[in-house]
Interface confidence: low
Amino acid sequence: VLPAKPENISCIFYYEENFTCTWSPEKEASYTWYKVKRTYSYGYKSDICSTDNSTRGNHASCSFLPPTITNPDNYTIQVEAQNADGIMKSDITYWNLDAIMKIEPPEIFSVKSVLGIKRMLQIKWIRPVLAPHSSTLKYTLRFRTINSAYWMEVNFTKEDIDRDETYNLTELQAFTEYVMTLRCAPAESMFWSGWSQEKVGTTEEEAPYGLDLWRVLKPAMVDGRRPVQLMWKKATGAPVLEKALGYNIWYFPENNTNLTETVNTTNQTHELYLGGKTYWVYVVSYNSLGESPVATLRIPALNEKTFQCIEAMQACLTQDQLVVEWQSSAPEVDTWMVEWFPDVDSEPSSFSWESVSQARNWTIQKDELKPLWCYNISVYPVLRDRVGQPYSTQAYVQEGIPSAGPVTQADSIGVKTVTITWKEIPKSKRNGFIKNYTIFYQAEDGKEFSKTVNSNILQYRLESLTRRTSYSLQVMASTNAGGTNGTKINFKTLSISHHHHHHHHHH
């Protein structure tokens, strides 16, 4: 059987390296060898490239090497397939070297911002050494922000033969890291070089983008002054790299700018002491290039009635998040401020806050909160410059069993009764919401009994005990994760009724 006619001939000119053609079929049933017939020098010369018939198997590719590679030139290529049964020739194909030339990638040596030109990066590269000198090269520049998965592309051409070339990429984000890579090809060629090594550059810093501003209103002091804790942070959407040198605060009573006071600080929090009237507070951040837009906050008068619109709130846990959702009776409110901090007996060490827009839910990754800690979460409605009444809830991202059980004592011991009282477990030792308490009690050598009561009960009267009997007793506090017993106490019921109370404290 004759070999199949070679088809799908494809040739590529690797500049100053070789001229390679491939074809199909790649495999033949019987051993086949190939000749590639070429005419070059615009048809004046011809030669042959043979596949290596010393290697068994088919080889549907052949390369012509310098010095017979002439450029510019037009080649014709015909492939002959031969086996024991005969020869089969392909159609003659025509190749213009300029159209199939492939060159090395360029080398980017710098990606830098240009002083005073915002949101631009200048890319400098070296043309490939192995590229035709007089050739116009076309380029594709690919770029993306450092944390993005998507490349954007820009195409351009360079006519000159200067080996040090530049391109100015504009309309970028300020103070942002970009990754660049470049490829090139002779203007007429269908084959692009590979991509250059990636290079990173950062756009110039600008004046800060803006601030998010919030406050905590504290109770008025005896002298009538109100402590107001101001806090601010970089606005959502600000460039990741943005840094501020400092912050200017100014504040004044409403309708009386004559009483304006100013403060400069490098902290992101500041305590003001205000009178009972309505105040306005303004904060800007600044760096060496200028100031951010002003962040404004209205502090209501002491006696001002605030609006209430949050009707209900739920906190629920997903696999790796805490989600808080709320319902509102005011459809016009679409901005909310969420505060969260640990519920501890002392002043909370960490206080966090975040603005939510156009949603009635807030989500936080569980790993941003500590397990076994109770968090207070409050949501404030914000309508233009007015802040409404908050709605608060508590949540644990992970509950555990309490670190200690309740401290218990037996009071009012009678003949057949006893009143048990116990103290709430300190917040730091609860490790979860206390669901209930269980009282375990047992007479000496007798059966153990238990009684479970709600978490809001801290006292219980046991009845139907046996007179003049020693009992041991302990109270267990339970969370969703399980329970922990308090210390065991012992008491003995009386043999006859007394009119006065006995207080036994056995620990």
């Epitope: 998507y150 954007m152 309309e171 970028l172």
Partner: antibody
Framework: EVQLVESGGGLVQPGRTLKLFCVAS????????MTWIRQAPGKGLEWVAS????????YYPDSVKGRFTISRDNAKSTLYLQMNSLRSEDTATYYC???????????????WGQGTLVTVSS | DIVMTQSPTSMSISVGDRVTMNCKAS??????VDWYQQKTGQSPKLLIY???NRYTGVPDRFTGSGSGTDFTFTISNMQAEDLAVYYC?????????FGGGTKLELK
């Protein structure tokens, strides 16, 4: 107003070829990646092909790689999908979509055409 | 490729209901999840981008939440015109992938 108008769909036999067209208007075509998404009758959405704003790079899922070719003519604000070696499982409505733009990838598929139905059947 | 698993596949609801559907990504996609609505015989329409941002002109009864691998889409007060199939899509990494859809039907 942004508009994307697809055409070129129809009934075709398995193994044959078909070319879809999408003419864009109302925006600067060469600032945007463009994408073809398809939806088999009664089924969900499947990404088919994307092309970068300059046409320099193209992307395909394995299900169509080697058979479908996405291309564009920025001068004509037109997107193409050349479909070769068609199979019955390619039967679907093919939507032309825009996104993302030069500055980033905030919204992927904001604008969709009305779709063009391709039926592959003998 | 990242697989987006949507649940439930269909729901029977009444006007005024609160409707919640979920989408789970096979790996972390940050907040790069969009939600689309497709009514019968129409092209899909973007409702929510970047997990929780409502697209221009979308009513505020539509909300989205989540990040990482778990995402939720809620219609707080179901209207008759909301009957449609809803799809989630991740755009965090190539290729973009869609969930199988949740179809809303009237009881």
């Amino acid at each position: 107003e942004v508009q994307l108008v697809e055409s070129g769909g129809g009934l075709v036999q398995p193994g044959r070829t078909l070319k879809l067209f999408c003419v864009a208007s109302g925006f600067t075509f060469n600032n945007y990646w463009m994408t073809w998404i398809r939806q088999a009758p009664g089924k969900g959405l499947e990404w088919v092909a994307s092309i970068t704003n300059t046409g320099g790079s193209t992307y395909y899922p394995d299900s169509v790689k080697g058979r479908f070719t996405i291309s564009r003519d920025n001068a004509k604000s037109t997107l193409y999908l050349q479909m070769n070696s068609l199979r019955s499982e390619d039967t679907a409505t093919y939507y032309c979509t825009r996104g993302p733009d030069y500055g980033g990838h905030l919204n992927w598929f904001v604008y969709w055409g009305q779709g063009t139905l391709v039926t592959v059947s003998s | 490729d990242i697989v987006m698993t949507q649940s439930p596949t269909s729901m029977s609801i009444s006007v005024g209901d609160r409707v919640t559907m979920n989408c789970k990504a096979s790996q972390n996609v940050g907040s790069n999840v969009d939600w689309y609505q497709q009514k019968t015989g129409q092209s899909p329409k973007l409702l929510i981008y970047k997990a929780s941002n409502r697209y221009t002109g979308v009513p505020d009864r539509f909300t989205g939440s989540g990040s990482g691998t778990d995402f939720t889409f809620t219609i707080s007060n179901m209207q008759a015109e909301d009957l449609a199939v809803y799809y989630c899509m991740q755009s965090n990494s190539y290729p973009p992938t869609f969930g199988g859809g949740t179809k809303l039907e009237l009881k």
